[in-house]
């Protein structure tokens, strides 16, 4: 799978994580920080 950094408009897309652009799937993906989950890393869990 080809990946690159997300475009600058997506800077705020991932609330607690890193935004990755999955080129072949035409979608943005959030790699969440430890303790966070959800499509956009918006949920905190213990």
């Amino acid at each position: 799978v080809s990946i690159t950094k997300c475009n600058s408009d997506m800077n705020g897309y991932c609330l607690h994580g890193q935004c990755i652009y999955l080129v072949d799937m035409s979608q943005n993906y959030c790699r969440c920080e430890v303790g966070y989950t959800g499509v956009r890393c918006e949920h905190f869990y213990l």
Epitope: T4, N7, D9, G12, Y13, S26, Q27, N28, R40
Partner: antibody
Framework: QDQLVQSGAEVKKPGASVKVSCKAS????????IQWVRQAPGQGLEWMGR????????KYREKFEGRVTITADTSTNTAYMELSSLRSEDTAVYYC?????????WGQGTLVTVSS | DIQMTQSPSSLSASVGDRVTITCKAS??????IAWYQQKPGQAPRLLIQ???TLQPGVPSRFSGSGSGTDYTFTISSLQPEDIATYYC????????FGGGTKVEIK
């Protein structure tokens, strides 16, 4: 199956406002950005602005600043685009477009006619 | 706002011809360009995103290339069903469409 279903055609008088809705099904709009694009008859595509429904943050094209308002109701999974002070040049098909979780999934379009 | 200058605005070519459309951005858009096809009365159809990535179901005669500010869209062998208007879209910093290119058969 993911869908963006827009409200029906509207006829408005110059100076009035119009509010177009865009209801999402099959996905949560909080996971996406919702863009708005318009196309006047026989003309090209024009990006108007977008909303991040999760953060409730908006960005508008300079040309529309102060005249367009994009909102989202996450409880009903619906986005809205309101355009005020309508003029004849605003006659166009207005599209909502999902971006973020996938690349640019389009609604069916809403024709807004501005005529006296 | 980033400006996208698309050329030509229209072209006429024969079936089987190679067709090339260009888009120039007013600043580096880091390969974040997409190409759409639109037929009369229809919503735009995404053909290519991230400069050269073909969408599923799109024929391989369509291709894209470029980097920095200069991008190219090519139809290697024009078919009658390719008659449409084509638009580039930059999506690096917000969004801007090119003015469109109307492709007709000679």
């Amino acid at each position: 199956q993911d869908q963006l279903v827009q409200s029906g055609a509207e006829v408005k008088k110059p100076g009035a406002s119009v509010k177009v809705s865009c209801k999402a099904s099959g996905f949560n709009i909080k996971d996406t950005y919702i863009q708005w694009v318009r196309q006047a008859p026989g003309q090209g595509l024009e990006w108007m602005g977008r909303i991040d429904p999760l953060r409730r943050s908006t960005k508008y094209r300079e040309k529309f600043e102060g005249r367009v308002t994009i909102t989202a109701d996450t409880s009903t999974n619906t986005a809205y685009m309101e355009l005020s002070s309508l003029r004849s040049e605003d006659t166009a098909v207005y599209y909502c477009v999902r971006s973020g979780t996938s690349f640019d999934f389009w609604g069916q379009g809403t024709l807004v006619t501005v005529s006296s | 706002d980033i400006q996208m200058t698309q050329s030509p605005s229209s072209l006429s070519a024969s079936v089987g011809d190679r067709v090339t459309i260009t888009c120039k951005a007013s600043q580096d858009i880091h390969k974040y360009i997409a190409w759409y096809q639109q037929k009369p009365g229809q919503a735009p159809r995404l053909l290519i995103q991230y400069t050269s990535t073909l969408q599923p179901g799109v024929p391989s005669r369509f291709s894209g290339s470029g980097s920095g500010t200069d991008y190219t869209f090519t139809i290697s062998s024009l078919q009658p069903e390719d008659i449409a208007t084509y638009y580039c879209l930059q999506y690096d910093n917000l969004r801007t469409f090119g003015g469109g290119t109307k492709v007709e058969i000679k």
